[in-house]
């Protein structure tokens, strides 16, 4: 039961995390105009990965997409790539984890296959979360560097009187959404990996002994069945298979690779 809960919770946490990564990637507020210690303007600037926006105090907002690929900073391209990779891996991980969920029965899928899928999705979630955290952190670092450079320009008066007001940018809401979402995806992935350990049938518990009788052969396995069958006394295996939606007939009609005849 604990394994099912861990797997289910890992899936839900990862789902929320990936939704957050998608939201952060689409958000326009990756960087917002720094209002502290600046002249009060009637115009507010903010920028995303895909477009930059200007909100006037009149309420009019204008957004312009970055309609160039080659003209964009390499760092911005790298952040975009990291976020997209994170989303793609997360989406694939979600797809895999749906089939791996213990509460969902798909055909004759073995528990070892579910364990492998759970581990795969867990790893994908971990990498997805790391990609998002890395992407957001790279962007944040870029902002910090530019912030202090523009502050230095402001106070040292480099290059004399410039024709544009030095607009400084600080952390936008999308960065915090990205960090939290990346963290949640990472946590979800770790939970899936932990659940996988509980799902995977241990070799020592499945070393069945074959007794050859005349005319037919029967395999006796210690544990591995639901408690109601009365077979075996291995509490660990009972715990794992408790709550499973299988009947005794199902177990018998779909032998696994651990059944030795």
């Amino acid at each position: 039961m604990a394994v099912t809960a861990c797997q289910g919770l890992g899936f839900v946490v990862s789902l929320i995390g990936i939704a957050g990564i998608i939201a952060a990637t689409c958000m326009d507020q990756w960087s917002t105009q720094d209002l502290y210690n600046n002249p009060v303007t009637a115009v507010f600037n903010y920028q995303g990965l895909w477009r930059s926006c200007v909100r006037e105090s009149s309420g009019f907002t204008e957004c312009r997409g970055y309609f160039t690929l080659l003209g964009l900073p390499a760092m911005l391209q790298a952040v975009r790539a990291l976020m997209i990779v994170g989303i793609v891996l997360g989406a694939i991980g979600l797809l895999v984890s749906i089939f791996a969920l213990k509460c969902i029965r798909i055909g004759s899928m073995e528990d070892s296959a579910k364990a492998n899928m759970t581990l795969t999705s867990g790893i994908m979630f971990i990498v997805s979360g790391l990609c998002a955290i890395a992407g957001v952190s790279v962007f944040a670092n870029m902002l910090v560097t530019n912030f202090w450079m523009s502050t230095a320009n402001m106070y040292t008066g480099m290059g004399g009187m410039v024709q544009t007001v030095q607009t400084r940018y600080t952390f936008g809401a999308a960065l915090f959404v990205g960090w939290v979402a990346g963290g949640l995806t990472l946590i979800g992935g770790v939970m899936m990996c932990i659940a996988c350990r509980g799902l995977a049938p241990e070799e020592t518990n499945y070393k069945a002994v074959s007794y050859h009788a005349s005319g037919h052969s029967v395999a006796y396995k210690p544990g591995g069945f639901k408690a109601s069958t009365g077979f075996g006394s291995n509490t660990k295996n009972k715990k794992i298979y408790d709550g499973g939606a299988r009947t005794e007939d199902e177990v018998q009609s779909y032998p696994s690779k651990h059944d030795y005849v």
Partner: antibody, heavy 118, light 113 residues
Framework: QVQLVQSGAEVKKPGASVKVSCKPS????????IDWVRQAPGQGLEWMGG????????VYNEKFQGRVTLTADKSSSTAYMELSSLRSEDTAVYFC???????????WGQGTLVTVSS | DIVMTQSPDSLAVSLGERATINCKSS????????????LTWYQQKPGQPPKLLIY???TRESGVPDRFSGSGSGKDFTLTISSLQAEDVAVYYC?????????FGGGTKVEIK
Amino acid sequence: QVQLVQSGAEVKKPGASVKVSCKPSGYAFTNYLIDWVRQAPGQGLEWMGGINPGSGDTVYNEKFQGRVTLTADKSSSTAYMELSSLRSEDTAVYFCARRVRGNSFDSWGQGTLVTVSS
Amino acid sequence: DIVMTQSPDSLAVSLGERATINCKSSQSLLNSGNQKNYLTWYQQKPGQPPKLLIYWASTRESGVPDRFSGSGSGKDFTLTISSLQAEDVAVYYCQNNYFYPLTFGGGTKVEIK
């Protein structure tokens, strides 16, 4: 069409207060900021402040801070400008205006003459 | 506060001739976010409220004749009336729409020579 109708002329004594109203029509009252601009006789234009009728948020010219209060009544779709501690130099025509894109003022009230005299 | 300096104070131009009004800001009104200059031009006739002519330094308001044009960027701006008409006699104001408080220039009176 968009119209901003202001209250009539006022004559006040120094130290008194005046409250000028501005009733816009022809658009959704809460969708645009209302600004107040004054013009002393034979002088130029001076921005006093602005209010967002939807949220009630205000921004003031520091020159008038503490003396001017901008309010908006959504139920009657009317904006108000109250100027206290009146002085003779406050004698001017007070305009309300609608703020649009570019933070510019596209529609103006007809103006309200406030005369401060002892 | 941003100081808006208009020149000349008054201008006499013959009908059909070009009239040019200058406006200088103490700080740049160019917003780096959208590369727009937050400067507006108004026309005010005696006994009337001001009328919006041009916003974003060069965008003509709908209904404004195309003989009115705005140009300039950063700190220096110009309003040009390509062919002065009798109805253009008025006082013209520039306004900073970027920094609070929103300040106006002193005005330029345009008359017919």
